[in-house]
Interface confidence: low
């Protein structure tokens, strides 16, 4: 058939691989676009075809599977590079077809260089460790399928540029790196280099991830409202600007949604017929505890507005809290008028 279901360029799968290392790339059709797997497609007589467009070119070319030492090969729904070269960068297309059916998708592949300390343009996954929480582990990612279980690779772990050996609280254990107890000083980039033999050659897989030490769930508390509080009274005259900050501290909680909002007379500000604006700012501590500030602002407050109830609310996975601001209308100071009598002294 002439027609082909073209899923276009799948930029969600921006694949980055290191130069001079093996890479195995699965055709995204079976993972994200079609409801059947490669085995089913193959059994049904469908053929998977690969081609590519070089960087800064428009011309689609077949992939050369006849390179020395089978540098590029295909196995089922996987395209293999053993190893990659810089000029392998480009858009790769996998197409599944027979005489009556066709479906294809393209995806970008970027081959990147790393320096001697593993720095590179590679986007790094972030792994969060709880501070002072006991033993926690990170695992060397994305190495499955590169070698059979009968092959025993050597794995070397680095922090930054340095091989991890004789570190006080960090212990390499094969594919895992164990943190006996995590501190802020453990923040940084950790790299595992997996070395394995294949057909008389030695290959390296380099995987770097960023470790971020965050607040421990043991120390997590419900949101704490620092402002408004009982010590501050917002006393204004009609016509003045009313500014009330709601400042809330949130303990770090993995995957928790932190929310702060104001109510005025029990309603959302949008539902009140007054000209109110709310500006939010967010800051984080070194362990990713969060402080959110929402400043409620009424440019020209009326005496009616000064009688309303202004309540700051906060919610996290640990609970919900609320605190009312004390808002008052300023009592005008008495005006002393001196009336001059006719005489000053007693007559």
């Amino acid at each position: 058939s002439e027609r082909c279901d073209d899923w276009g360029l799948d930029t969600m799968r921006q694949i980055q691989v290191f130069e001079d290392e093996p890479a195995r790339i699965k055709c995204p059709l079976f993972e994200h676009f079609l409801k059947f797997n490669y085995s089913t497609a193959h059994s049904a007589g469908l053929t998977l075809i690969w081609y590519w467009t070089r960087q800064d070119r428009d011309l689609e070319e077949p992939i050369n599977f006849r390179l020395p030492e089978n540098r590029i090969s295909k196995e089922k729904d996987v395209l293999w590079f053993r190893p990659t070269l810089l000029n392998d960068t480009g858009n790769y297309t996998c197409m599944l077809r027979n005489t009556t059916y066709c479906s294809k998708v393209a995806f970008p592949l970027e081959v990147v260089q790393k320096d001697s300390c593993f720095n590179s343009p590679m986007k790094l996954p972030v792994h969060k460790l709880y501070i002072e929480y006991g033993i926690q582990r990170i695992t060397c990612p994305n190495v499955d399928g590169y070698f059979p279980s009968s092959v025993k690779p050597t794995i070397t772990w680095y922090m930054g540029c340095y091989k991890i050996q004789n570190f006080n609280n960090v212990i390499p254990e094969g594919m895992n790196l164990s943190f006996l107890i995590a501190f802020i000083s453990n923040n940084g980039n950790y790299t595992c280099v997996v070395t394995y033999p294949e057909n008389g050659r030695t290959f390296h897989l380099t995987r770097t991830l960023t470790v971020k030490v965050v607040g421990s769930p043991k120390n997590a508390v419900p949101p704490v409202i620092h402002s408004p509080n009982d010590h501050v009274v917002y006393e204004k005259e009609p016509g003045e600007e009313l500014l009330i900050p709601c400042t809330v501290y949130f303990s770090f909680l993995m995957d928790s949604r932190n929310e702060v909002w104001w109510t005025i007379d029990g309603k959302k500000p949008d539902d009140i017929p007054i000209d109110v604006t709310i500006n939010e700012s967010i800051s984080h501590s070194r362990t990713e505890d969060e402080t959110r500030t929402q400043i409620l602002s009424i440019k020209k407050v009326t005496s009616e507005d000064l009688k309303r109830s202004y309540v700051c609310h906060a919610r996290s996975a640990k609970g919900e809290v609320a605190k009312a601001a004390t808002v008052k209308q300023k009592v005008p100071a008495p005006r002393y008028t001196v009336e001059l009598a006719c005489g000053f002294g007693a007559t």
């Epitope: 001697s116 593993f118 930054g160 540029c161 340095y162 070395t195």
Partner: antibody
Framework: EVQLVESGGALVQPGGSLRLSCIVS????????ITWFRQAPGKGLEWVAT???????YYASWAKSRFTISTDTSKNTLFLQMDSLRAEDTAVYYC??????????????WGPGTLVTVSS | QIVLTQSPATLSASVGDRVTITCQAS??????LAWYQQKPGKAPKLLIY???TLPSGVPSRFSGSGSGTEFTLTISSLQPDDSATYYC????????????FGQGTKLEIK
């Protein structure tokens, strides 16, 4: 363009102390691992110590007790404190960027060196 | 402790010659070897890393090969500017390394 420049070399008496500095211009020092090497007159290169800022320090076995490597990341400066100096410590001292440790570590950037002479 | 042994210690060759310097490691260091060039009164300059990779700016007449324990630096066509001392350096073992370098090879132009 990153540059390394050593300073602090001088003539010092045996038993004396000296502090060498290595200023790194360009990106933050904390992004790099810096190593001190030395080269005695007419001799080969000898590793002294390496620092991975905020992570760890490494010393040649002979340097451990007398030399201390440190950094001031705010000033982008690396230091080598040398105590109980001996005549055999006379050498040109180099700082270099890079590290030891993986199968392709190399020192890709070197300072011009600073001369330390230990003599009475 | 890994020891690197370079040979020859000194070498004299003519402009245009093909020159080879070898470096032997006392135990296998995979491809963890770098080569440096040093001219009198100057700092060393990185020529080759990862046994055979040239950094940018290094002339293509320099090449490196080998893995395990035997390594070679080759200058395909010697130039007058190549007169220098050449050092190999292992980047395999960190920690308590007494000396990461070979003893050097002095190359003179005839």
């Amino acid at each position: 363009e990153v540059q390394l420049v050593e300073s602090g070399g001088a003539l010092v008496q045996p038993g004396g102390s000296l502090r060498l500095s290595c200023i790194v211009s360009g990106p933050s020092l904390s992004h790099f691992d810096i190593t001190w090497f030395r080269q005695a007159p007419g001799k080969g290169l000898e590793w002294v110590a390496t620092i991975s800022p905020g992570v760890s320090t490494y010393y040649a076995s002979w340097a451990k007790s007398r030399f201390t490597i440190s950094t001031d990341t705010s000033k982008n400066t690396l230091f080598l404190q040398m105590d109980s100096l001996r005549a055999e410590d006379t050498a040109v001292y180099y700082c270099a960027r890079g590290g030891v440790g993986s199968s392709w570590k190399a020192f890709d950037l070197w300072g011009p060196g600073t001369l330390v002479t230990v003599s009475s | 402790q890994i020891v690197l042994t370079q040979s020859p210690a000194t070498l004299s060759a003519s402009v245009g010659d093909r020159v080879t310097i070898t470096c032997q490691a006392s135990e296998s260091i995979s491809t963890a070897l770098a080569w440096y060039q040093q001219k009198p009164g100057k700092a060393p300059k990185l020529l080759i890393y990862k046994a055979s990779t040239l950094p940018s700016g290094v002339p293509s007449r320099f090449s490196g090969s080998g893995s395990g324990t035997e390594f070679t630096l080759t200058i395909s066509s010697l130039q007058p500017d190549d007169s220098a001392t050449y050092y190999c350096q292992q980047g395999f073992s960190s920690g308590n390394v007494h000396n990461a370098f070979g003893q050097g090879t002095k190359l003179e132009i005839k």
